[in-house]
Amino acid sequence: KSEMPQPVSIQDINHRVWVLQDQILIAVPRKDRVSPVTISLISCRHVETLEKDRGNPIYLGLNGLNLCLMCAKAGDQPTLQLKEKDIMDLYNQPEPVKSFLFYHSQSGRNSTFESVAFPGWFIAVSSEGGCPLILTQELGKANTTDFGLTMLF
């Protein structure tokens, strides 16, 4: 089991990358002047206490920025948020911190990220682009939930 976060770059099937804008992650087309964030991911060390068949439970952080992705309810709806958090602090906790955990599932070159706290809700980007990352239950419709990961370094 890795004990260091793995830096990755993420883009969707429409070649849009994740960019940090006013503390919000948005998906934009890759261009010369766009500087995508590097995502850090690390597997939960309590994997034996989480469901085995949904993917690899991981924490997702923004490399070097002390920000992590988490899911929280806003009214009735789970929302995707960035919280100031050291990914290693999450990793070392005595129990899985479910609000910050995602099941990473890979099929060929495509990856999905399903919220552990809200099963059935996936990280997604609107098909229009230039929009914030969201959580959705609607797979393969107006939102893209399939992403490509490239390991860095």
Epitope: L50, E51, K85, D89, Q93, P94
Partner: antibody, heavy 121, light 109 residues
Framework: EVQLQQSGAELVEPGASVKLSCTAS????????INWVKQRPEQGLEWIGR????????RYAPKFQGKATITSDTSSNTAYLQLSSLTSEDAAVYSC??????????????WGQGTTLTVSS | QAVVTQESALTTSPGETVTLTCRSS?????????ANWVQEKPDHLFTGLIG???NRAPGVPARFSGSLIGDKAALTITGAQTEDEAIYFC?????????FGGGTKLTVL
């Protein structure tokens, strides 16, 4: 209001089994970890184990493996502690507690009122 | 299994500062033990006070603080009040299970 309501006192014969309950109100047990602890007079607290009601996975203290079984029923928002092959050593007050993450830490935050188990023939 | 040791009893006066400690049989207590402190009042009324060594639970008065002092976890009550008379338990995390201490009976008179 968040509450953990535990079942009433039990008087059980040696060698038998008992199942204690802990019913939550004011929150969904799937959103927390439910822990069980044992307390005997003048002996402090002993952590027995915990369950994640969202998936049923459990952890136990080494001492209680084989003695205790923790289960949950999300439809009734209840966690259970079953103790088997009871002896006088198992006579104690058993309490349930939630373990929740706030901000940057886990806390044993909400507690049941305890269930007294007496083992006697 | 590790043994967690606390002072069996301490006495303080209202307004005074008192520190309770929590020692591990396996060596120095560190932040990786995620020390928790829990208060017990009569009739098995428990309240979680501190988690992760030094973080106060929501709603817990600021006079309660957690820290590491030397090789032990510590709970300090700054300006003790009569209602703080209780038994205080620490719990330490050891890789995959918690171990509670025997408790400290704090008398405030």
């Amino acid at each position: 209001e968040v509450q953990l309501q535990q079942s009433g006192a039990e008087l059980v014969e040696p060698g038998a089994s008992v199942k204690l309950s802990c019913t939550a109100s004011g929150f969904n047990i799937k959103d927390t970890y439910i822990n069980w602890v044992k307390q005997r007079p003048e002996q402090g607290l002993e952590w027995i184990g915990r369950i994640d009601p969202a998936n049923g996975y459990t952890r136990y203290a080494p001492k209680f493996q084989g003695k205790a079984t923790i289960t949950s029923d999300t439809s009734s928002n209840t966690a259970y502690l079953q103790l088997s092959s009871l002896t006088s050593e198992d006579a104690a007050v058993y309490s349930c507690s939630t373990l929740n993450y706030y901000g940057s830490s886990f806390f044993f935050d909400f507690w049941g009122q305890g269930t007294t188990l007496t083992v006697s023939s | 299994q590790a043994v967690v040791t606390q002072e069996s009893a301490l006495t303080t006066s209202p307004g005074e500062t008192v520190t309770l400690t929590c020692r591990s049989s396996t060596g120095a207590v560190t932040t990786s033990n995620y020390a928790n402190w829990v208060q017990e009042k009569p009739d098995h009324l428990f309240t979680g006070l501190i988690g992760g060594t030094n973080n106060r639970a929501p709603g817990v008065p600021a006079r309660f603080s957690g820290s590491l002092i030397g090789d032990k976890a510590a709970l300090t009550i700054t300006g003790a009040q009569t209602e703080d008379e209780a038994i205080y338990f620490c719990a330490l995390w050891y890789s995959n299970h918690w171990v509670f201490g025997g408790g400290t009976k704090l008398t405030v008179l």
